[in-house]
């Protein structure tokens, strides 16, 4: 019961990201800064904390990254909006877990999220949003690894 099911088509999200990844990353100008990439904090998250960290990272992307990023290309914006909508749906799923008291946030989980927010705050808002979007595959891979993903019909 510690793992909450994410009933979202992760493959669809990953495909959308692959289509815009190069365009987003090409605008990244900070090779020595990372927000999620190779984040040891994410690698050592205990099963007990997976739901909380997922919930917090979804909130990070929905409430900060997607809002801070101003995309001039309508085709890319459509892909980002599609990913954002999928994240909103995942948030809804995890809220049901919370109601069942299956998504408790321990200190380790809170710390991991704080590190990511701190990394984000180190950069100017636009640059931070670009870098975080470019590192979306890190988060998606982590979700795939840590959740039993149910593909919706």
């Amino acid at each position: 019961l510690r793992r909450c099911l994410i009933s979202t088509d992760m493959h669809h999200i990953e495909e959308s990201f692959q289509e815009i990844k190069r365009a987003i990353q090409a605008k990244d100008t900070f090779p020595n800064v990372t927000i999620l990439s190779t984040l040891e904090t994410l690698q050592i998250i205990k099963p007990l904390d997976v739901c909380c960290v997922t919930k917090n990272l979804l909130a990070f992307y929905v409430d900060r990254v997607f809002k801070d990023h101003q995309e001039p290309n309508p085709k890319i914006l459509r892909k980002i909006s599609s990913i954002a909508n999928s994240f909103l749906y995942m948030q809804k799923t995890l809220r049901q877990c919370q109601e069942q008291r299956q998504c408790h946030c321990r200190q380790e989980a809170t710390n991991a999220t704080r590190v990511i927010h701190d990394n984000y705050d180190q950069l100017e808002v636009h640059a931070a949003a670009i870098k975080s979007l470019g590192e979306l595959d890190v988060f998606l891979a982590w979700i795939n690894k840590n959740h039993e993903v149910m593909f919706s019909a």
Epitope: I20, Q25, N32
Partner: antibody, heavy 120, light 111 residues
Framework: QQLEESGGGLVQPEGSLTLTCTAS?????????ICWVRQAPGKGLEWLAC????????TYYANWAKGRFTISKTSSTTVTLQMTSLTAADTATYFC?????????????WGPGTLVTVSS | DVVMTQTPASVEAAVGGTVTIKCQAS??????LAWYQQKPGQPPKLLIY???KLASGVPSRFKGSGSGTQFTLTISDLECADAATYYC?????????????FGGGTEVVVK
């Protein structure tokens, strides 16, 4: 999966030429960086331009190449490089390459190259 | 723009020996460095990416190291087939790093 360049040959100074990069075994319908890199005889590699073949269609050029060179995706299997106002300094082998920048470099791919000679 | 400086321009070594090629970036590029081998009449062949990761099918005699601004390619147990020109390249995904992204090359002569 392969890339092949075509369109090279002898061209007069101040002339124009269009090179074509053709993909086989995969298509440019998905997002790739397709880039042109050139190499003058006996010299090193010089990056020229890249295009994102995905939804963005973004193009990037080396500072020295802006204005005289134009990279375009012309079909799901072809990318072209239009070159104008050519001089002897543009004499080189022109390579087409896939994903030589970014995290997909481990899946990068180069064509054999096509020789462009600018001479009267 | 980042500028990649490669040394030496040429190096000679005996079969079975070791060769070390250095590449310096004008500013820090993290670990976004690739090494290529090129033989006359052929396109470059990827050897190393992310500074130290071996490309598919490349023998472990080729070793990449370094990060930031200083990088090294070491070829050990030299074979005649290793005679070629070697190039370093900054392969960072940010387009502002693409101009001048290749080093000038190092010719390796195997005796």
């Amino acid at each position: 999966q392969q890339l092949e360049e075509s369109g090279g040959g002898l061209v007069q100074p101040e002339g124009s030429l269009t090179l074509t990069c053709t993909a086989s075994g995969f298509s440019f319908s998905s997002s790739y960086w397709i880039c042109w890199v050139r190499q003058a005889p006996g010299k090193g590699l010089e990056w020229l331009a890249c295009i994102d073949t995905g939804v963005s269609g973004d193009t990037y050029y080396a500072n020295w190449a802006k204005g005289r060179f134009t990279i375009s995706k012309t079909s799901s299997t072809t990318v072209t490089l239009q070159m104008t106002s050519l001089t002897a300094a543009d004499t080189a082998t022109y390579f087409c390459a896939r994903d030589i920048f970014g995290s997909a470099i481990d899946n990068s791919l180069w064509g054999p190259g096509t020789l462009v000679t600018v001479s009267s | 723009d980042v500028v990649m400086t490669q040394t030496p321009a040429s190096v000679e070594a005996a079969v079975g020996g070791t060769v070390t090629i250095k590449c310096q970036a004008s500013e820090s590029i993290g670990n976004a460095l690739a090494w290529y081998q090129q033989k006359p009449g052929q396109p470059p062949k990827l050897l190393i990416y992310d500074a130290s990761k071996l490309a598919s099918g490349v023998p472990s005699r080729f070793k990449g190291s370094g990060s930031g601004t200083q990088f090294t390619l070491t070829i050990s147990d030299l074979e005649c087939a290793d005679a070629a020109t070697y190039y370093c390249q900054c392969h960072y995904h940010g387009s502002s790093y693409w101009d001048n992204s290749f080093g000038g090359g190092t010719e390796v002569v195997v005796k």
